[in-house]
Interface confidence: medium
């Protein structure tokens, strides 16, 4: 299925999920790593505050499920969560899902290759017990714990390459782009908002490409 197939509005939109606002807008008090989205965000200040906490109430997800996650690693997971909760520029990759906790998800968001590489480099000595974090946890305590038989090993054991981490971690929410940061063709997890949000241009590019593809398909069906 093509990404974004379920929506006609691809630009400046919020996903229909657990904590997202219905429409993006300014949020002056976004916390710490989520602050780059202040001018236009799908997250509230309280969501941004909460997601910086270990085992936050947002999802009861414990980053430290195999001992303390290195701070250099954890910052990437916080940034990933900020992008997920706050970005209004992921419309081209929204897909409908039938899940109890959300109606939509992202699929194959083209993450800039350096952002993925750096995430992997900063995390490969931290520890985990699973290669897909959407599925298979023991939730009996209310917080994710390693399932029986899942051994705590270094990230590199479960995510041997940058692609295995970025693409496998959240069931293909991301794919690693061939493009580099600043190209206007890939989504940056990290950016300096003083220069504006570079992901706006990326969303415009892919939304336009999707409209062209959709038009070609309509044209093709009309004539055949």
């Amino acid at each position: 299925a093509d990404p974004g197939q379920d929506r006609t509005d691809l630009l400046n939109v919020c996903m229909d999920a657990k904590h997202h606002k219905t429409k993006p807008g300014p949020e002056d008090k976004l916390h710490d790593q989520c602050s780059p989205w202040k001018k236009n965000a799908c997250c509230t200040a309280s969501t941004s505050q909460e997601l910086h906490k270990d085992t936050s109430r947002l999802y009861n997800f414990n980053w430290d499920h195999c001992g303390k996650m290195e701070p250099a690693c954890k910052r990437h997971f916080i940034q990933d969560t900020c992008l997920y909760e706050c970005s209004p520029n992921l419309g081209p990759w929204i897909q409908q899902v039938n899940q109890s906790w959300r109606k939509e998800r992202f699929l194959d968001v083209p993450l800039c290759k350096e952002d993925c590489q750096r995430w992997w480099e900063d995390c490969h000595t931290s520890h985990t017990c699973k290669s897909n974090w959407h599925r298979g946890w023991d939730w009996t305590s209310g917080v994710n714990k390693c399932p029986a038989g899942a051994l705590c090993r270094t990230f590199e054991s479960y995510f041997p390459t940058p692609a295995a981490l970025c693409e496998g971690l959240w069931s293909h929410s991301y794919k690693v782009s061939n493009y580099s940061r600043g190209s206007g063709r890939c989504i940056q997890m990290w950016f300096d908002s003083a220069q504006g949000n570079p992901n706006e241009e990326v969303a415009r590019f892919y939304a336009a490409a999707m409209h062209v593809n959709a038009g070609e398909m309509l044209h093709h069906h009309h004539h055949h």
């Epitope: 290759k113 993925c116 590489q117 699973k130 290669s131 897909n132 959407h134 599925r135 298979g136 399932p147 038989g149 899942a150 051994l151 590199e156 054991s157 479960y158 041997p160 390459t161 940058p162 692609a163 295995a164 693409e167 496998g168 971690l169 069931s171 293909h172 794919k175 690693v176 061939n178």
Partner: antibody, heavy 118, light 109 residues
């Protein structure tokens, strides 16, 4: 456009070795793992092992441990699979496949037929 | 055990719906991927992760999973869907991959 192009068919004698190459293009070679999978005539797919194209780390199926060696040349964006001590049961089509996350093989080479015959 | 079990053969009438299953312990904590292979050709990924279609794969293909069983469903099977279908999964206990034995799908009519 992502492409994996493999070397041509080989005929080998029992006891010999074979080295198959897989040239990747259209993506950043070092960010993905490359796996090798084989298929004997009329048989199922059989996973052999993989290499982390970034740092060269390898993992092999127990069945092939000691007989298979997977290497890569990052400057040529090419992965190699060498199988030694060949026997007739090794007659198969050998595929390289790019891994997006542990067994999601989104691109495959065209396959290389290796025939082991005396 | 790290085995993945598939029915060797399944048939479906043209235009009808068919489900191909894959069973194994590794599927309790890992998603299956599904491949279509036609004679003399390399396999083609048709479903990956939870229920994701690679571009170019028709949306009559879908995937699902429950417990230790993953399923590939083809809704409105076409003659072009006649092929062998393989599941694979990462093995929970190590950094290895295992394939199912394959299912030969015949489209009747």
């Amino acid at each position: 456009e992502v492409q994996l192009v493999q070397s041509g068919a080989e005929v080998k004698k029992p006891g010999a070795s074979v080295k198959v190459s897989c040239k990747a293009s259209g993506y950043t070679f070092t960010i993905y793992a490359m796996h090798w999978v084989r298929q004997a005539p009329g048989q199922r797919l059989e996973w052999m092992g993989w290499i982390n194209a970034g740092n060269g780390n390898t993992k092999y199926s127990q069945k092939f441990q000691g007989r298979v060696t997977i290497t890569r040349d990052t400057s040529a964006s090419t992965a190699y699979m060498e199988l030694s001590s060949l026997r007739s049961e090794d007659t198969a089509v050998y595929y390289c496949a790019r891994d997006i996350s542990y067994g999601s093989f989104d691109y495959w080479g065209q396959g290389t037929l290796v025939t082991v015959s005396s | 055990s790290s085995e993945l079990t598939q029915d060797p053969a399944v048939s479906v009438a043209l235009g009808q719906t068919v489900r191909i299953t894959c069973q194994g312990d590794s599927l309790r904590s890992n998603y299956a991927n599904w491949y279509q292979q036609k004679p003399g050709q390399a396999p083609v990924l048709v479903i990956y992760g939870q229920n994701n279609l690679p571009s170019g794969i028709p949306d009559r293909f879908s995937g699902s999973s429950s417990g230790n069983t993953a399923s590939l469903t083809i809704t409105g099977a076409q003659a072009a869907d006649e092929a062998d279908y393989y599941c694979d999964s990462r093995v929970s206990t190590g950094i290895h991959v295992v394939f199912g034995g394959g299912t030969k799908l015949t489209v009747l009519g």
